[in-house]
């Protein structure tokens, strides 16, 4: 949750986290669907993904994605310089060579082909939520989380604490 | 540096009321997640309370609800416990906590305040 | 709610000799493919610190003798070699779901 002021002080925070093992502490694969459950599917569309949010019908399999587990140091926000505890993050690949990646500049969700060691565009602060839910933050613009608009996965702004329970940037991880 | 520090224990009467007060600082306190754990005299430890960043959100344990609320003040960078109908039972230190950067811990831990329950 | 077993009660060491203590949840504690079993270090007078998230991670500033594994519902936690300061009740916990719940400790004294 950030409080406004909090926002401009973890952007530097954030971004200058380090992994702390270029290896993840764990892997898991799952389906990943919205607090309103329509499933985030992707679809190969001339020779690149597209992330859709939709409705399955009855019977349809649910897309999955792996996500890699990382544990990272948090700097301290006061200084800059020092470190205050421990977070997760998390990448995200839905197939074989592809990462979520977050476009800060056009403010969207990407599905990107690139190598290890993977870009800090494709790392996510994991949020623990109630009602079992998680959100995605961006390492790369903290305070920007991953949500939906208009059917599409979008990045979104959280201005405020009260801002990081609104239900477009809260997530469901299932294993079936 | 991260810092907690509880205050408001001390002696009351069963059925009376405590107000219990933790000032953080060292961090962008709206951030976290907040808690409150107690131990009672060579005991173990009890989660007693959560409150989410945002004040969204808060969890009791059974044992309290109806009697303690949590609540917090991020202008003031203070977490509070305001505890009614007080019990022998409730005889404890109390900590407050914060949760790591996401939620999913305890992570930093107050020294404790003493809250006395006794006739 | 989960129930958190610790045993030993008390583990009697030396210095330098290896502590295992053990951790066992009356249901998984996995989720989202993680373990949310923590351990906590608490020395007389003094709050806990944590020493492991998440099964197997070490906090800030934890040293490399200290060291968890386990998943599901069995875990432990493994001092190497013990230095004098180490010598303290270890509990563990689950941050699973709501109540979050601790073990009862392990005292680890000196022999």
């Known amino acids: 949750a950030f409080g406004i002021s909090g926002v401009q002080k973890y952007t530097r925070a954030l971004h200058d986290s380090s992994i702390t093992g270029i290896s993840p502490i764990t892997e898991y694969l799952a389906s990943l669907s919205t607090y309103n459950d329509q499933s985030i599917t992707f679809a190969l569309e001339d020779e690149s993904y597209e992330i859709y949010v939709e409705d399955l019908k009855k019977d349809e399999k649910k897309d999955k994605v792996l996500l890699s587990y990382y544990e990272s140091q948090h700097p301290s926000n006061e200084s800059g310089d020092g470190v205050d505890g421990k977070m997760l993050m998390v990448t995200l690949s839905p197939t074989k060579d592809f990462w979520l990646h977050a476009n800060n500049k056009e403010h969207s969700v990407e599905l990107h082909k690139c190598e290890k060691p993977l870009p800090d565009q494709a790392f996510f602060v994991l949020h623990n939520m109630h009602s079992n839910c998680v959100s995605f933050e961006c390492k790369t613009d903290p305070g920007v989380f991953i949500g939906v608009k208009d059917n599409h996965l979008a990045l979104i702004k959280v201005d405020s604490s009260e801002n990081l329970c609104t239900e477009n940037i809260l997530f469901k991880l299932s294993e079936t | 540096e991260v810092q907690l520090v509880e205050s408001g224990g001390g002696l009351v009467q069963p059925g009376g009321s405590l107000r219990l007060s933790c000032a953080a600082s060292?961090?962008?306190?709206?951030?976290?997640?907040m808690s409150w754990v107690r131990q009672a005299p060579g005991k173990g430890l009890e989660w007693v309370a959560t409150i989410s960043g945002g004040k969204t959100f808060t969890d009791y344990v059974d044992s309290v609800k109806g009697r303690f609320t949590i609540s917090r003040d991020d202008s003031k960078n203070t977490l509070y416990l305001q505890m009614n109908s007080l019990r022998a039972e409730d005889t404890a230190v109390y900590y407050c906590?914060?949760?790591?950067?996401?939620?999913?811990?305890?992570?930093?831990w107050g020294q404790g305040t003493l809250v006395t329950v006794s006739s | 709610e989960i129930v958190l077993t610790q045993s030993p009660a008390t583990l009697s060491l030396s210095p330098g000799e290896r502590a295992t203590l053990s951790c066992r949840a009356s249901e998984s504690v996995a989720k989202y493919g993680l373990s949310l079993l923590n351990w906590f270090q608490q020395k007389p007078g003094q709050p806990p610190r944590l020493l492991i998230f998440?099964?197997?991670n070490r906090g800030s500033g934890i040293p490399a003798r200290f060291s968890g594994s386990g998943s599901g519902t069995d875990f432990t936690l493994t001092i190497s070699s013990l230095e004098p300061e180490d010598f303290a009740v270890y509990f563990c916990?689950?941050?699973?779901?709501?109540?979050?719940?601790f073990g009862q400790g392990t005292k680890v004294e000196i022999k």
């Open positions: 998440a099964a197997s």
């Open positions: 906590t914060r949760a790591n950067y996401g939620n999913w811990f305890f992570e930093v």
């Open positions: 060292g961090f962008t306190f709206s951030s976290f997640s």
């Open positions: 916990q689950q941050s699973k779901e709501v109540p979050f719940t």
